[in-house]
């Protein structure tokens, strides 16, 4: 029962951070203008993996794609490539811990194969959530160096009088999303890898002895021994619901008639 | 169309408060800021303030503040600027307007003259 | 704040000939974010609101003549009207659109020659 609950848990947390981290991937805000020392702003500029976002007072929304690939920073394409591998990972893990799941029963699959494919998803969650945490890990460091360089040449001066304002930078909400995902991820993986070591049949091989009776020639031949745990059958008729993730890039306070690509 | 109508002239003795209103119609009033703008006689152009009638949050200019309050009545699309402890230099046409892209001000009331004088 | 300053404060064109007005931000008003800069261009004849012509610094608003047209980035930007009429007789304001609070140039008073 604990080794179902266990495994059920599992694939409930991972299921959550796969969609988080989804959610967190195409999120716009993986950078924001950084309003510190002037929190109410005509202009508000953030960044995303795909495209960069300029939200301004008056409520209308203009978003651009990256549309070049060679033009981009290394660093982009590396958070890019952690997260959409982080994803796919996550997605056939998802796929095999299904099939996996003790409560359900596919044709006479034996438990050994189900502890097998349980820790086959339990290791794809866990490196899902690493490249998850890896990539918003990359992107955070990458801000912290740039904010800081962009600090260090905040006011440009341009014929004395005259000034340009750089445009610093710091963490949005979608790295938040992701650390909390990668970190949902890498938990559910771990609890399948646990919950497989529950299922793995400890089956004590007795060699095949054969006991000779008078006047009956029965033989005995006991083999690996398996505990039934009442779950083969689903008599509970219970439903598989397979929840669709919705994702909000960010709250606007106008309506979606207001942005415009 | 989007039409701004503002309420009549008003003539106030220095110390008072003057509150001007401007009915929005033509468009969902809750969807666009509404910019306030003053033009003194013979002079430019100056932004006292816009508010946000979804949130009521607005957002002044510093020279202006502590002395002007915008607010919304949504169930009448109907915004209002009360400027207090009046001084002869704030007689001006006041103007509210309103936001398009750009931050630009496409739409504009039709203004308010306020007379400061003893 | 950002100051604007305009000019010249007056100008004085012939019917048909090309006006032009400068306006200069202290500050630049280009955003990076999507390399548009925050200035707009008003209209105002006597007795009348302010006519939205230009945002963006050089996008023209929708019922503008194409005889006005706005250029320039950073902190220094013009207002062109090709081809002078009559009704172009006003004057002409810029505004900074980027950072609170908003401002405007003095004002350049357009006449005829």
């Known amino acids: 029962m604990a080794v179902t609950a266990c495994q059920g848990l599992g694939f409930v947390v991972s299921l959550i951070g796969i969609a988080g981290i989804i959610a967190a991937t195409c999120m716009d805000q993986w950078s924001t203008q950084d309003l510190y020392n002037n929190p109410v702003t005509a202009v508000f500029n953030y960044q995303g993996l795909w495209r960069s976002c300029v939200r301004e007072s008056s409520g209308f929304t203009e978003c651009r794609g990256y549309f070049t690939l060679l033009g981009l920073p290394a660093m982009l394409q590396a958070v890019r490539a952690l997260m959409i591998v982080g994803i796919v990972l996550g997605a056939i893990g998802l796929l095999v811990s299904i099939f996996a799941l003790k409560c359900i029963r596919i044709g006479s699959m034996e438990d050994s194969a189900k502890a097998n494919m349980t820790l086959t998803s339990g290791i794809m969650f866990i490196v899902s959530g690493l490249c998850a945490i890896a990539g918003v890990s990359v992107f955070a460091n990458m801000l912290v160096t740039n904010f800081w360089m962009s600090t260090a040449n905040m006011y440009t001066g341009m014929g004395g009088m005259v000034q340009t304002v750089q445009t610093r930078y710091t963490f949005g909400a979608a790295l938040f999303v992701g650390w909390v995902a990668g970190g949902l991820t890498l938990i559910g993986g771990v609890m399948m890898c646990i919950a497989c070591r529950g299922l793995a049949p400890e089956e004590t091989n007795y060699k095949a002895v054969s006991y000779h009776a008078s006047g009956h020639s029965v033989a005995y031949k006991p083999g690996g021994f398996k505990a039934s745990t009442g779950f083969g059958s689903n008599t509970k008729n219970k439903k598989i619901y397979d929840g669709g993730a919705r994702t909000e890039d960010e709250v606007q306070s106008y309506p979606s008639k207001h942005d415009y690509v | 169309q989007i039409q701004l109508v503002q309420s009549g002239a008003e003539v106030k003795k220095p110390g008072a408060s003057v509150k001007i209103s401007c009915k929005a119609s033509?468009?969902?009033?809750?969807?666009?800021?509404m910019n306030w703008v003053r033009q003194a006689p013979g002079k430019g152009l100056e932004w006292i303030g816009n508010i946000d009638p979804y949130y009521g949050s607005p957002t002044y200019n510093h020279k202006f503040k502590g002395r002007v309050t915008l607010t919304v009545d949504t169930s009448t699309s109907t915004a209002y600027m009360e400027l207090s402890s009046l001084r002869s230099e704030d007689t001006a046409v006041y103007y509210c307007?309103?936001?398009?892209?750009?931050?630009?001000?496409?739409?504009w009331g039709q203004g308010t003259l306020v007379t400061v004088s003893s | 704040d950002i100051v604007m300053t305009q000019s010249p404060s007056s100008l004085a064109v012939s019917l048909g000939e090309r006006a032009t007005i400068n306006c200069k931000s202290s500050q630049s008003l280009l955003n990076s974010g999507n390399q548009r800069n925050y200035l707009t261009w008003y209209q105002q004849k006597p007795g009348q609101p302010p006519k939205l012509l230009i945002y963006w610094a050089s996008t023209r608003e929708s019922g503008v003549p194409d005889r006005f047209s706005g250029s320039g980035s950073g902190t220094d930007f013009t207002l062109t009207i090709s081809s002078l009429q009559a009704e172009d007789v006003a004057v002409y304001y810029c505004?900074?659109?980027?950072?609170?609070?908003?401002?405007f140039g003095q004002g350049t008073k357009l006449e005829i020659k």
């Open positions: 307007a309103n936001y398009g892209r750009g931050n630009s001000f496409p739409y």
């Open positions: 505004q900074n659109d980027y950072s609170f609070p908003f401002t």
């Open positions: 033509g468009y969902s009033f809750t969807d666009y800021h």
